[in-house]
Amino acid sequence: NFPRTVMVNLNIHNRNTNTNPKRSSDYYDRSTSPWNLHRNEDPERYPSVIWEAKCRHLGCINADGNVDYHMNSVPIQQEILVLRREPPHSPNSFRLEKILVSVGCTCVTPIVHHVA
Amino acid sequence: NFPRTVMVNLNIHNRNTNTNPKRSSDYYDRSTSPWNLHRNEDPERYPSVIWEAKCRHLGCINADGNVDYHMNSVPIQQEILVLRREPPHSPNSFRLEKILVSVGCTCVTPIVHHVA
């Protein structure tokens, strides 16, 4: 159980793994469902900068390097926690906020909707 | 600028839009780089439950439904913030922690480093 208001130390501890955590940074370009990264900045939020992925194509890139519209590029989304200054501009009072971010894209087989 | 220790209200505000945040929940199965979701639970962490994606295959699924090893299934990872009880078992004192989670998988053209 968690109380309603807690004290939080903002001195971040980083839990590293056996390999370089920045490793996936080139996948946006090499994926069959490539994406662009857009900077979302909000000084009232912690972290203030979040990168949002936007799929480049509706379809996916095939072996010839062309867009295949028989497949769909779709965003992989995740709900993440951020801290929002509350009340606004408050120096040391925050509220947890849940936001949905697109992390990257993947190529999926389409669901065919039959039109009557 | 952020002070070292702040007060945080854990009554989460949900900023998600009118789209269903679970919309991408079937992508794990329909992707050309499908993945399984594994539950990671830690009572000393907030949120205590995080879902981790594990790619099912080394290669990607081709149009025939077979694994194509000329392409690589790779995890899309994101660094997220969580709250870690500090000191351990503390009821209302936490520290921000950055952890790397795999959100899903994507299919990439390989950079051949060591695989023939």
């Epitope: - | 080394l58 290669g59 790397l100 480093h113």
Partner: nanobody, 123 residues
Framework: QVQLVESGGDLVQAGGSLRLSCAAS????????MGWFRQAPGKEREFVAA????????KYTDSVKGRFTMSRDNAKKQVYLEMNSLKPEDTAVYYC????????????????WGQGTQVTVSS
Amino acid sequence: QVQLVESGGDLVQAGGSLRLSCAASGLTGSSYAMGWFRQAPGKEREFVAAISWISGDTKYTDSVKGRFTMSRDNAKKQVYLEMNSLKPEDTAVYYCNDMPYGLDTRMDEYVYWGQGTQVTVSS
């Protein structure tokens, strides 16, 4: 922290067989593949084989295809390398490791390696 313990290496005659084992602990929640690597004297460490924890898919370097078989035991968090028709050029220290990016994992990215297990093939 990842801990890797390899075993099963030995001195064997050309044409002989060995079975290597690797026990892995401390793997991250997203770990989805394991690999075997080897380093011969005076040479760089190279990829030998990989396996997916979930599907059991395997991939081998060309020089061991048809001779080596990689398998896994999910419950024990162990992987194995069955080595048949061994050749003198298979002589090396064999290592296992997590492959957090599957076949895209780069050799120079690893932080931790186990001690490895020595395989010597005499002619």
